[in-house]
Amino acid sequence: KKVVLGKKGDTVELTCTASQKKSIQFHWKNSNQIKILGNQGSFLTKGPSKLNDRADSRRSLWDQGNFPLIIKNLKIEDSDTYICEVEDQKEEVQLLVFGLTANSDTHLLQGQSLTLTLESPPGSSPSVQCRSPRGKNIQGGKTLSVSQLELQDSGTWTCTVLQNQKKVEFKIDIVVLAFQKASSIVYKKEGEQVEFSFPLAFTVEKLTGSGELWWQAERASSSKSWITFDLKNKEVSVKRVTQDPKLQMGKKLPLHLTLPQALPQYAGSGNLTLALEAKTGKLHQEVNLVVMRATQLQKNLTCEVWGPTSPKLMLSLKLENKEAKVSKREKAVWVLNPEAGMWQCLLSDSGQVLLESNIKVLPTW
């Protein structure tokens, strides 16, 4: 007999064709011989089956000898053998209805697990293969699990259910809730205004939660909370902010913070956490601030950086348009008795300048 696979919630059309290309009497029954529907002349008649309100046919096709059974809003329990009786013949169609659902919610935090559960009719033995948006294939039976979801897992998952050499495809949209970047670094000269941005990697109609920025200054022994805020319907409202530094926060997404000026005592690392309503766990983004200061004290020209710099970064002091006088993989460099002119302090990574501060050395008479 013919096998047809259907998807829970969808509509399926089971075909039944007579040899005569005209409207004749037909009946559709289930395996218990309960009439589902049929015709009486040009009228559609329905039987006492549980499909009553979800079953239909296409009257426009009857004149061509086609008598389909249409079942709307499919349920797993609609899986059955359906019998079409026409012209003293019986056509049997086995319908197998499958459903594929995400374990809890299709909006999951980065690092959480995604479990896809297959609902299938008794007696079936389907196999499932899913392809993630980044092209990763996973296979399984009744359940498929993906641990440690990553940002690239956001998007449409395409899952194929295979049964009796037939296949049915499911598409599930998964949203991984995360910040666009796990970490960022800001390089600033002393006194400059600092802007931190925390763009989210997803968009939702309403976004509600609360967040906090904890800061570990390089010079401090412990971290402290710089700001706490609420997020309601995408509007940000500050709950509490430290007096030093006096941060400003934007009232709209993406989350945005402004530090009035970069000072050595603020250099360090921060961790912004965002707890979303009805979600367990938090979103995290690390932010780092590196501050540079160039000073001249008597006969000593010094350049210093504070904050989380990698060991491969180079700190240099050079007179404008000349070779570097001093270059070290350290956080402070100096030149004794510098010549007069415009000196540049440069923080660079493999030749790329990350931060530059200029200081004018006046001639000594």
């Epitope: 319907n233 934007g250 709209k252």
Partner: antibody, heavy 118, light 107 residues
């Protein structure tokens, strides 16, 4: 058509109170933040207060904090500004404004005049 | 509070002229800036939001640009109905603050 109509302005003595109303129509009132902005005679625009959508967070300018109260009745599509302990410097035309989805004041009423004088 | 400084405070121009008004914020406000127009005795009319997005119904001769602290409103070809006072407004955070206004007069 989106419309905002202010009412309740008038002459009041220093120390007195006044309640301004703003009747809104032409949009789903409960889903938008609403604000009051004022303009003293011959001067520029000054933001007074904002109330967010159905959550009801409220924000005030320092110059009116503790004296003015913004509120809304979503069932009546009406925004209010209760003004107490009025001062001469509160004399202004008060405009009711609607925020758009991006929280910008995109629609303004015609204004109602408040005069604080003895 | 964030201070908004508009310049010039007034300017004289002729119909057809290209007019530029600038607005500077005392701190970075991303592109959270709007522009509105006010004619004498009338309520302000909203022109531009998010620094460069034109409010529906606003003629395309109006344009906005800028990010961070420096913003510009440009009227490419001044029309008789454009003589008015223009205000910038920071919408980065509370308190919302306006520039002091720029009056565009007929030369």
């Amino acid at each position: 058509e989106v419309q905002l109509l202010e009412s309740g302005g008038g002459l009041v003595q220093p120390g007195g109170s006044l309640r301004l109303s703003c009747a809104a129509s032409g949009f789903t009132f409960s889903t938008y933040a609403m604000s009051w902005v004022r303009q003293a005679p011959g001067k520029g625009l000054e933001w007074v207060s904002t109330i967010s959508d159905n959550i009801g967070n409220t924000y005030y300018a320092d110059s009116v904090k503790g004296r003015f109260t913004i509120s809304r009745d979503n069932s009546k599509n009406t925004l209010y500004l209760q003004m107490n302990s009025l001062r001469a410097e509160d004399t202004a035309v008060y405009y009711c404004t609607k925020d758009n989805e991006d929280y910008y004041m995109d629609v303004w009423g015609k204004g109602t005049t408040v005069t604080v004088s003895s | 509070a964030i201070q908004m400084t508009q310049s010039p405070s007034s300017l004289s121009a002729s119909v057809g002229d290209r007019v530029t008004i600038t607005c500077r914020a005392s701190q970075g406000i991303r592109n959270d800036l709007g522009w509105c127009q006010q004619k004498p005795g009338k309520a302000p009319k909203f022109l531009i939001y998010a620094a460069s997005t034109l409010q529906s119904g606003v003629p395309s001769r109006f344009s906005g640009s800028g990010y961070g602290t420096d913003f510009t409103l440009t009227i490419s070809s001044l029309q008789p109905e454009d003589f008015a006072t223009y205000y910038c407004l920071q919408d980065y955070n509370y308190p919302r603050t306006f520039g002091q206004g720029t009056k565009v007069e007929i030369k």
